[in-house]
């Protein structure tokens, strides 16, 4: 995550420092479109992997147990093939003219329809979304190479549904139980979360308006991984680091155009799944088998 | 105090390469992307490209074939190289920060024999 | 590309007056546009970004507003320091792209 040298607090009277609020953002599109795109672009396919991942691919049953309440988790495990005609995402729901994410190459039209990963507009407006300052073009995020093949990676069936179980302190912990097909892994990030020191390299399509100076050979990631293991693993941010990471005062009400600069940076923490902790990594007193969710709010 | 300093030739031969170092203090390059815009007479205010925290680039297309952007964040340094200069390249090259009041002092690099 | 259009390249004004300066966007661009003071010899200077927001240390005689593909940037109580060229830009889409100018003289 780029870490701010300067003093945080800006000096803007929006109380946004717009030049850090467009580099974070793109920071965490690049985080995310490096995991899921290919060549510099999100496709449908992509798009349902980023979902099923921050599990809003499908609806979920959840069972909330009280202390007192010990019920086996055993019985969810189908959840996901009994909902799967709830997928509400089709190919043509998520074009807009926002130039940003694209989920196609739309090279013969000329027109460049991208979809902001946050967006509170209706999908189909012309670049209606005030808050991609970075524009919603510019934001042609950046790791967009072709390192994700949706056919490497793990079918929604194979995830199974989201269980929260309450402990006596009245926090939830989830659990996402997965089960993967023999022989297939979850790899994990690989991507650093600290920027390289020294780079030239543009890992992108002519067609956006970038340049591809090295071929793209790297072994893919598939798109399904625990959490974010790396030697630099992603924190887990609240929302007062939210907001001072992206140039944010923190007293200050957030407009619509301002929470839109959050958007990337909070679905990547998700991705990231960098809130939750395993419990063999960390002593805590919850149930066996569950990650727990660490307070960021 | 955040500073971006230019230092680059004035004068450059028609089809050869201009070659801008932007030298930032005040911030660092793993924080914010830097920006390249152009002003000419003829052409006003044209918006060149940017290089990322990561590293990573975006071009405007019209300059796409010719133009590269890189950096050094132990530096401070970002690295402007342009290729194939024509006399319609004259211009005055600046480096900025985003859309803010921190831009360079410009270079102005006249492309003639 | 998105054009941004400034249809007045000239505007003429008195000191003590009121004058507003426009921008047009080929397409909307929501609010995502800076509004850019330059004087000659000088690198553009960032008076408003997000149509509508000044950055510190800039007069509050200077107001911008607009969203979608209609700006204004107001000028009320002008100075003889405000004698400039005032360039609009948007950083919606790629390229971001700047609008032709409107140089302000002082009568």
């Known amino acids: 995550f780029p870490q701010t040298t300067e003093k945080i607090s800006p000096n803007w009277e929006s109380g946004i420092n717009v030049d850090l609020a467009i580099s974070t953002r793109q920071y965490h599109l690049q985080q995310l479109f490096y995991r899921y795109g290919e060549n510099n672009s999100l496709s449908v396919e992509g798009f349902r992997k980023l979902l099923q991942n921050i599990g809003i691919d499908k609806i979920k049953r959840i069972h909330i147990h009280h202390d007192h309440d010990h019920h086996s988790d055993h019985e969810h495990h189908s959840d996901h093939e009994r909902h799967s005609d709830h997928e509400h995402h089709s190919e043509h729901e998520h074009h807009s003219d926002h130039d940003h994410h694209s989920h196609h190459n739309h090279a013969a039209s000329g027109k460049n329809k991208r979809k902001a990963l946050c967006p509170d507009h209706d999908s189909d407006s012309s670049g209606k979304d005030p808050r991609n300052s970075q524009g919603k073009g510019a934001h042609r995020p950046e790791h967009a190479s072709g390192r994700r093949n949706v056919k490497d990676s793990v079918s929604a069936s194979e995830v199974t549904s989201t269980v929260y179980n309450t402990v006596s302190e009245g926090t939830h912990f989830l659990e996402t139980i997965e089960t993967p097909r023999p022989g297939k892994l979850f790899p994990k990030d690989v991507s650093s979360s600290t920027p390289p020191s020294v780079t030239s390299k543009s890992r992108v399509s002519r067609l956006a308006g970038r340049k591809t100076n090295e071929s793209v050979s790297e072994p893919r990631k598939g798109f399904m991984y625990s959490r974010n293991t790396n030697e630099n693993p992603q924190e887990c941010f609240n929302a007062s680091k939210l907001l001072t990471s992206h140039g944010m005062g923190i007293q200050v009400p957030l407009n619509a155009t301002e929470f839109n600069y959050l958007c990337p940076a909070i679905i990547n923490q998700i991705d990231a799944r960098s809130c939750l902790i395993h419990t063999s990594e960390k002593k805590a007193e919850i149930p066996p088998k569950t990650y727990s969710l660490q307070i960021a709010w | 105090q955040v500073q971006l300093k230019q230092s680059g030739p004035g004068l450059v031969q028609p089809s050869q390469s201009l070659s801008i170092t932007c030298t930032v203090s005040?911030?660092?390059?793993?924080?914010?992307?830097i920006h390249w815009v152009r002003q000419s007479p003829g052409k006003g205010l044209e918006w060149l490209g940017v290089?990322?925290?990561?590293?990573?680039?975006d071009y405007n297309a019209a300059f796409i074939s010719r133009l590269s952007i890189s950096k050094d964040n132990s530096k401070s340094q970002v690295f402007f190289k342009m290729n194939s200069l024509q006399a319609n390249d004259t211009a005055i090259y600046y480096c900025?920060?985003?859309?803010?009041?921190?831009w360079g002092q410009g270079t102005l690099v006249t492309v003639s024999a | 590309d998105i054009v941004m259009t400034q249809s007045q390249k000239f505007m003429s004004t008195s000191v003590g007056d009121r004058v507003s300066v426009t921008c047009k966007a080929s397409?909307?661009?929501?609010?995502?546009v800076v509004w850019y003071q330059q004087k000659p010899g000088q690198s553009p200077k960032a008076l408003i970004h997000?149509?509508?927001y000044r950055y510190s240390g800039v007069p509050d005689r200077f107001t911008g507003s607009g969203s979608g593909t209609d700006f204004t940037l107001t000028i009320s109580n002008v100075q003889s320091e405000d004698l400039a060229e005032y360039f609009c830009?948007?950083?919606?889409?790629?390229?971001?792209?700047f609008g032709g100018g409107t140089k302000l003289e002082i009568k």
């Open positions: 900025a920060r985003g859309p803010s009041s921190y």
């Open positions: 005040g911030f660092s390059l793993t924080t914010y992307g």
């Open positions: 290089i990322w925290t990561g590293g990573t680039t």
């Open positions: 397409q909307n661009v929501d609010t995502n």
């Open positions: 997000s149509a509508s």
């Open positions: 830009q948007q950083y919606n889409n790629y390229p971001w792209t």
